[in-house]
């Protein structure tokens, strides 16, 4: 004969566990129904009655099957340096990530707690390492034969143009100037930009910031404060 299906609440067999989407209520000593995401337990089960669930109120949520008495509060509104990549619903918390040009200097389980502007490399310096969602830009001095004449968190050092006759030699912060109307060939037709990091919902990813406005607070976590940008504007 087929085993009889037990309906909640029911007493589990000795040594067995409750089924999926059920929990063992210590008081009733019964297997009872969990509430679905977006709901919470309004009334706990007894030996004769199952869990009574109710929808989460506005600005609260439950993401998992649960038997919590109250839904969790959604996080506060995203700050001005952040974008809301996931709205607060009855089934999910709000997620804030850093807006383009910023990176996450202090992450939390989901999203970002503190965004900071990506460092800008000053003229004579280019981006050695682009900003990521979780790390700042790193700059480097432009090597001989290359230059950057911008203050930017994305521009790399570009080769000097090649002249038939050089009027003014290029340096780290200026392109060469040719005497003829057009150079033999220009190796650097325009500013080369690095792609901005994309804000994703991946666990520890961060966008990009600009340094001069970065908060000055040092967060003494297990290890310290935040990052510098090569050849920054503040030198």
């Amino acid at each position: 004969l087929p085993a009889q299906v037990a309906f909640t609440p029911y007493a589990p067999e000795p040594g067995s566990t409750c089924r999926l989407r059920e929990y063992y209520d210590q008081t009733a000593q019964m297997c009872c129904s969990k509430c679905s995401p977006g709901q919470h337990a309004k009334v706990f089960c007894t030996k004769t009655s199952d869990t009574v669930c109710d929808s989460c109120e506005d600005s609260t949520y439950t993401q998992l099957w649960n038997w919590v008495p109250e839904c969790l509060s959604c996080g506060s509104r995203c700050s001005s340096d952040q974008v809301e990549t996931q709205a607060c619903t009855r089934e999910q918390n709000r997620i804030c990530t850093c807006r383009p040009g910023w990176y996450c200097a202090l992450s939390k389980q989901e999203g970002c707690r503190l965004c900071a502007p990506l460092r800008k490399c000053r003229p004579g310096f280019g981006v050695a390492r682009p900003g990521t969602e979780t790390s700042d830009v790193v700059c480097k001095p432009c090597a001989p034969g290359t230059f950057s004449n911008t203050t930017s968190s994305t521009d790399i050092c570009r080769p000097h143009q090649i002249c038939n006759v050089v009027a003014i030699p290029g340096n780290a912060s200026m392109d060469a100037v040719c005497t003829s109307t057009s150079p033999t060939r220009s190796m650097a037709p325009g500013a080369v930009h690095l792609p901005q990091p994309v804000s994703t919902r991946s666990q520890h990813t961060q966008p990009t910031p600009e340094p001069s406005t970065a908060p000055s607070t040092s967060f003494l976590l297990p290890m310290g404060p935040s990052p510098p940008a090569e050849g920054s504007t503040g030198d």
């Epitope: 390492r129 790390s135 790193v138 700059c139 935040s226 990052p227 940008a229 030198d235």
Partner: antibody
């Protein structure tokens, strides 16, 4: 607990290539720059370069371009450094180290135990 | 590249006294009011260990007898009072731009 475990001592011939590894655990591998540092016997520390495992971006010390190649396998949370055209000058201890880029500072907070490379004919 | 110059190359300090190590950068390692200068301690057969970051900040677990100061191009590491276990080589390192560069090291001996 953050850990960086490097491969063991290597003995190689001049002209050969070697590849050493740095296996990480205890943190999100794709979220931190991994650096490599060289230390010749009785000498100071020399920065080789760095890789960001999240997208494989690299930045090298000009001196080591063409000498060192940095790679990472995210599924194994392991960084690698390959050194080619070996000479006696490449005999050294090589460290992998994680760079922490927190708000308003960058620093190497965790280091591997080092891989000793001896180049000898 | 930023050249980091440490002095002295070695020093011997009596137990309980003060050890002072200097580090000079060939150009400023400051950005937006912060100094990107770190100090590491290395003992024979061991990897370097972070001692001070951002010129003056102590990571957790580092004794308060270690302190760092300075900005721009001139930085100082102080150890007071010096203990036996502080015998090691100390390196400064700038993290303001690539390539990252280290000082030549200062070997501290305890008398």
């Amino acid at each position: 607990e953050v850990q960086l475990q490097q491969s063991g001592t290597v003995l190689a011939r001049p002209g050969a290539s070697v590849k050493m590894s740095c296996k990480t655990s205890g943190y999100t591998f794709t979220s931190y720059w991994m650096h490599w540092v060289k230390q010749r016997p009785g000498q100071g520390l020399e920065w080789i370069g760095t890789i960001y495992p999240g997208n494989s971006d690299t930045s090298y010390n000009q001196k080591f371009k063409g000498k060192a190649k940095l790679t990472a396998v995210t599924s194994a949370s392991t960084a690698y450094m390959e050194l080619n055209s070996l000479t006696n000058e490449d005999s050294a201890v090589f460290y992998c180290t994680r760079e922490n880029l927190l708000l308003r500072s960058y620093f190497f907070d965790y280091w591997g135990q080092g891989t000793t490379l001896t180049v000898s004919s | 590249d930023i050249v980091m110059t440490q002095s002295p190359a070695s020093l011997a300090v009596s137990l309980g006294q003060r050890a002072t190590i200097s580090c000079k950068a060939s150009q400023s390692v400051d950005y937006d009011g912060d100094s990107y200068l770190n100090w590491y301690q290395q003992k024979p057969g061991q990897p370097p260990k972070l001692l001070i970051y951002a010129a003056s900040n102590l990571p957790s677990g580092i004794p308060a007898r270690f302190s760092g100061s300075g900005s721009g191009t001139d930085f100082t590491l102080n150890i007071h009072p010096v203990e036996e276990e502080d015998a090691a080589t100390y390196y400064c390192q700038q993290s303001n731009e690539d390539p990252r560069t280290f000082g030549g090291g200062t070997k501290l001996e305890i008398k």
